[in-house]
């Protein structure tokens, strides 16, 4: 009860009553003290007297304590993708008495669903609600509506408004939990066949059968198949085992693996399903090729004069493949070219670049040539080697050697003399010139012979025919 | 409509050799893989092998490999079961079915000295 | 190679109840299962081909279910005439395998 204080100046203080007036009531100084937080509602009771007639005993006075927020609660719900639910008490309650009945009770609507809608049962389906009364609620008219999007959660925040006494309830966030509904059909998105060796086993690439589906995962994705008119599938790891079904996953991880055997041209019927739907009639191409085997025939071996061009020809360079290939398309490619000469293309400046790419028609040509480059040093014989690749795909590269004999001693039309220089000599009438090195020099024919034995070792010149108009 | 026929009963003695048809009709014969099932009475169904009919490759079950071969003969629409060396445990009914969804009439081979 | 449980092996029942027929797997076989019906002396008879697709000629009453490795044949308001052996067979990968059958009685 509120007392004043002794002197003028000094404040009202509070304290305890166990009795009061009707005129301490009336002046407005007895108080109610609410002291529990969460407990709205209280009571006491009074003997009431009033000196005229018996007391009035155990009057009890109810107290409705009014929250400084309004007392919204949430409770979190499930709906179906796409489904709609009430939102009615207990999911949504305003506790205690009094405000339930206050007229202009409102929710507004804070945050509005991300997939989904708040909407009134009988209005506009359009968008969501931004606000709506406290009747609707009880009259159940207000529904939450999913989206039907492929989203496993959702939520929004209301807040409660009593307009007429300016008191609001904290933010409540609402979770809603979606349910999933397998609605989406599988679509088959990539189905571009394989191709293959003959005989051979290889995994169907995520990149060749793809399908994609909304609401399931790849490995729900299942293929099951007809009995593949060329061959079996199988699964990596239990290559004896035939299967009929295999999921996007395991194609995702290369696990599925098509073994050929049979015509060349062929396949698997299939129906796609993600469990729920199927999507049936569908055709995966297996189209296999013979294995091209490249071979390389001819003597491999080039035998050149000193210092002159040779060509190669197919006696000694001679590739054809299983296919029966057109020369034109095996294709050698220069790996290691020659250490003692150059090779070269009769069409192009001898001069040019080293050649690095010719063919097996431009072989049987003629044009492919190989030119020796006499040294400093006298030789009798000398070799030189050609590491070339035959490739014409998609047959498998095949490796080759040109072997390249340089010999003084072969019958070279270009180089009538084995000797090492053999010029002959300019003479003038009726005088003398001498036979040197320069003109004349056989030391080749020693070239085999170690540097520190050739002092042993001279070459001797016997002249088996004299010259008729002159004399040495 | 679609038909598997089998050839008819079979009574052999131990030892030899028998070779039951199954002829399809009504459907493009080399699309559908085709099998075959023996049923002993008072025992259930057994799967026996299959054939790849359009690549011509027979895989069978574990407790049929060896003495139990099939064929087919695709100019005929005909696939073959051959059991050599005959037990008598291999008295039974043979069915063949193309897929899962056709079955023959069954063959009934009885295997007795 | 993959297993098939049928259960139970023996079911008796009268006229209009409905039954289900279970067959298990020992591993997933992706709704590779189909279900037969095989009364004596006569073909097996298919009710239903991968775990739940309805087969033309077929009574309704007849009706599948499952995926993975566990399955089901329903059959609502059974009648006299459905009395046979029912067996179920997986046809995912070699070799393929059939269930030991369920014996339906009629009562």
């Known amino acids: 009860m509120v007392s004043r204080g002794a002197l003028a100046d000094e404040p009202p203080s509070l304290d305890p009553v166990q009795s009061f007036s009707q005129e301490a009531v009336d002046t407005g100084r007895v108080l109610y003290l609410h002291s529990r937080p969460e407990a709205w509602s209280d009571a006491f009771s009074l003997d009431v007297a009033s000196g005229l007639g018996a007391p009035l005993e155990g009057v009890l006075v109810e107290l409705e304590v009014l929250p400084a927020a309004i007392p919204l609660e949430a409770q979190n719900f499930s709906v179906p993708e796409g489904g709609s639910l009430t939102l009615a008490p207990p999911l949504l309650r305003v506790s205690g008495p009094y405000f339930p009945t206050l007229l202009g009770l409102s929710l507004q609507v804070l945050e509005p669903p991300q997939h989904g809608a708040l909407q009134k049962e009988d209005g506009p389906q359009a968008r969501t609600l931004s606000a709506f009364s406290w009747r609707m609620v009880e009259e159940q008219l207000i529904r939450y509506v999913h989206d039907g999007s492929e989203t496993l959660t959702d939520s929004f925040v209301l807040m409660a408004n009593a307009s007429e006494m300016d008191r609001q309830s904290h933010p409540v966030a609402f979770t809603v939990t979606v349910l999933p509904v397998n609605d989406q059909p599988p679509i088959l998105t990539t189905n571009t066949g394989l191709q293959m060796w003959e005989g051979a086993t290889a995994p169907i690439p995520a990149e060749a059968l793809r399908s994609t589906d909304g609401d399931s995962g790849s490995e729900d994705l299942v293929y099951t198949i007809e009995q593949p008119s060329n061959g079996r599938v199988v699964l990596r790891g239990a290559p004896g085992t035939e299967v009929r079904s295999f999921t996007q996953a395991q194609l995702d991880g290369g696990l599925v693996l098509f073994s050929h055997r049979g015509t060349l041209d062929g396949g698997f019927r299939f129906r796609l399903s993600d469990g729920e739907h199927t999507s049936p009639g569908h055709f995966f191409r297996v189209t296999a090729q013979k294995q091209v085997l490249l071979s390389l025939k001819g003597s491999q071996t080039l035998t050149v004069c000193p210092g002159s061009v040779q060509p190669l020809s197919s006696q000694t360079l001679r590739a054809s493949s299983s296919a029966g290939t057109d020369p034109q398309l095996l294709l050698y490619r220069v790996v290691r070219g020659p250490q003692l000469g150059r090779l070269f293309h009769a069409q192009q400046d001898s001069t040019g670049e080293a050649l690095v790419n010719f063919t097996q028609a431009e072989v049987y040509a003629g044009n492919i040539l190989y030119e020796h480059e006499m040294p400093p040093e006298p030789f009798w014989e000398a070799h030189d080697t050609l590491e070339l690749q035959l490739s014409s795909p998609p047959a498998r590269d095949v490796a080759a050697t040109l072997a390249v004999a340089v010999s003084f001693e072969a019958a070279c039309p270009q180089r009538p003399s084995h000797l090492w220089k053999n010029k002959g000599l300019w003479v003038p009438e009726g005088q003398r010139a001498r036979i040197t090195v320069a003109a004349l020099d056989a030391s080749n024919l020693l070239a085999s012979v170690p540097s520190p034995q050739r002092s042993e070792h001279d070459v001797l010149f016997q002249v088996t025919q004299f010259p008729s108009r002159g004399q040495l | 409509q679609i038909q598997l026929v089998q050839s008819g009963p079979e009574l052999k003695k131990p030892g030899e050799t028998v070779k039951i048809s199954c002829k399809a009709s009504?459907?493009?014969?080399?699309?559908?893989?085709m099998h075959w099932v023996k049923k002993t009475p008072g025992k259930g169904l057994k799967w026996l092998g299959w054939?790849?009919?359009?690549?011509?490759?027979?895989t069978y079950a574990d407790d049929f490999k060896g003495r139990f071969a099939i064929s087919l003969e695709t100019s005929a629409r005909t696939v073959y079961l051959q059991i050599n060396n005959l037990r008598n445990e291999d008295t039974a009914t043979y069915f063949c079915?193309?897929?899962?969804?056709?079955w023959g009439q069954g063959t009934t081979l009885t295997v007795s000295a | 190679d993959i297993k098939l449980s049928q259960s139970p092996s023996i079911l008796s029942v009268t006229p209009g109840e409905t039954v289900s027929l279970s067959c298990r797997a020992s591993?997933?076989?992706?709704?590779?299962l189909h279900w037969y019906q095989q009364k004596s002396h006569r073909s097996p008879r298919l009710l239903i081909k991968?775990?739940?697709d309805s087969i033309s000629g077929i009574p309704s009453r007849f009706t599948g279910s499952g995926s993975g490795t566990d399955y089901t044949l329903n059959i609502n308001s059974v009648k006299p005439e459905d009395e046979g052996i029912y067996y179920c067979?997986?046809?995912?990968?070699?070799?393929?395998?059939f269930g030991g059958g369920t014996k339906l009685e009629i009562k």
């Open positions: 054939i790849n009919t359009a690549t011509g490759e027979p």
């Open positions: 079915f193309s897929y899962y969804d056709y």
């Open positions: 591993q997933t076989i992706y709704k590779n």
């Open positions: 991968y775990g739940s």
């Open positions: 067979l997986q046809g995912y990968s070699t070799p393929w395998t």
């Open positions: 009504g459907y493009t014969f080399t699309d559908y893989s």
